[in-house]
């Protein structure tokens, strides 16, 4: 698997979208983990709802939020209030029992905001992403901007 490099501004939010084959991964929970070293274990940061049918509901651990659109085959991870310490190598995983299949490897880089508190705009396009199981990023231009997921009526 290729590693996708994503950059985000310190203090802002970074949104990672890992796509996958919805049929192949039917019924499987997803997880976001941080890799400890080049060949080290991947330490779980957050995983989707314990009930697969409710996987689209946001689950949070600290400043990291995950939600999974299981029908579309997209798991979205949001790293809020990005800090220098958040930089590193991560994985999107699909869980099957005790096994974890890597959907995408993501290298997160944190940039110091040269504009301080001003809006930075959309700065980044992924360097590389494979044709199907890729990752994308949306760079939040507002510090508290967040898409509601799911939409409430």
């Amino acid at each position: 698997l290729n590693t996708t490099v994503l950059q985000g501004m310190a203090g802002q939010s970074l949104r990672v979208s890992c796509t996958y084959d919805a049929l192949k991964h039917w019924g499987r929970r997803k997880a976001w983990c941080r890799q400890l070293g080049e060949e080290g274990p991947c330490q779980r940061v957050v995983s989707t709802h314990g009930v697969w049918l409710l996987a689209f509901l946001k689950k949070r651990n600290g400043s990291t939020v995950i939600a999974d659109d299981t029908l579309a085959g997209t798991v979205t991870i949001t790293l809020k209030n990005l800090q220098a310490g958040d930089a590193g190598l991560y994985q999107c995983q699909s869980l099957r029992g005790r096994e974890a299949e890597v959907l995408q490897k993501v290298l997160v880089e944190v940039l110091e905001d040269p504009l301080d508190d001003q809006d930075a705009g959309d700065l980044w396009v992924p360097e590389e992403s494979s044709s199907f199981e890729g990752a994308q990023v949306e760079h939040s231009t507002s510090r508290n901007q967040e898409t509601s997921f799911p939409p409430t009526s």
Epitope: L53, L54, F56, D69, L71, P150, P151, S153
Partner: antibody, heavy 126, light 106 residues
Framework: EVQLVESGGGLVQPGRSLRLSCTAS????????MSWFRQAPGKGLEWVGF??????????EYTASVKGRFTISRDGSKSIAYLQMNSLKTEDTAVYYC?????????????????WGQGTMVTVSS | DIQMTQSPSSLSASVGDRVTITCQAS??????LNWYQQKPGKAPKLLIY???NLETGVPSRFSGSGSGTDFTFTISSLQPEDIATYYC????????FGGGTKVEIK
Amino acid sequence: EVQLVESGGGLVQPGRSLRLSCTASGFTFDDHAMSWFRQAPGKGLEWVGFIGSKAYGGTTEYTASVKGRFTISRDGSKSIAYLQMNSLKTEDTAVYYCARGKRYSYTYWTPAFDVWGQGTMVTVSS
Amino acid sequence: DIQMTQSPSSLSASVGDRVTITCQASQDITNYLNWYQQKPGKAPKLLIYDASNLETGVPSRFSGSGSGTDFTFTISSLQPEDIATYYCQQYDSYLTFGGGTKVEIK
């Protein structure tokens, strides 16, 4: 009128089986998750399990105490949800309700149950 | 499993009184909480979903608030038809209900 009607309850001996039905009308059955709940006499509400909408291909989830004994299924052509209860125990004695999951959109719903049936009594006793 | 502690278990209030029921989760459940009303011999009725959203057709005297572990359900002006048992229900981890609060008129 949006309505759910349960049927199939009754007196059954421990270890035996029973199938409850929940007939839906007044809404597009395939679009909603359906759930079963129960309430033992004089007690509170307990979730039994639910089944996803047609989009989720009949995927089910159950509470731990009934897993392996109870099975939820649905028949879209008849707009009926079923609760198949096997190896019944005396502690399964309760009023059983079916309920409809509240829908946000094609993909999203919330396990807030906005339409309920009147309930059917299941008594497990020798 | 997440435990939902509802209090009080019962209360008696006068018509027109403000009634408050609390529900405490054993761990953070975000806003994944609903409130139901159940009258004797009847099925439950959804009043509030996602902690604070009023279900369509439910009178505005009913409201809900809270997030994390502490949630509140309020009837701003108790009416005779509000006599019932009220339940909270979480869905952050599977589905569990609080023990219920029986509301009576003084």
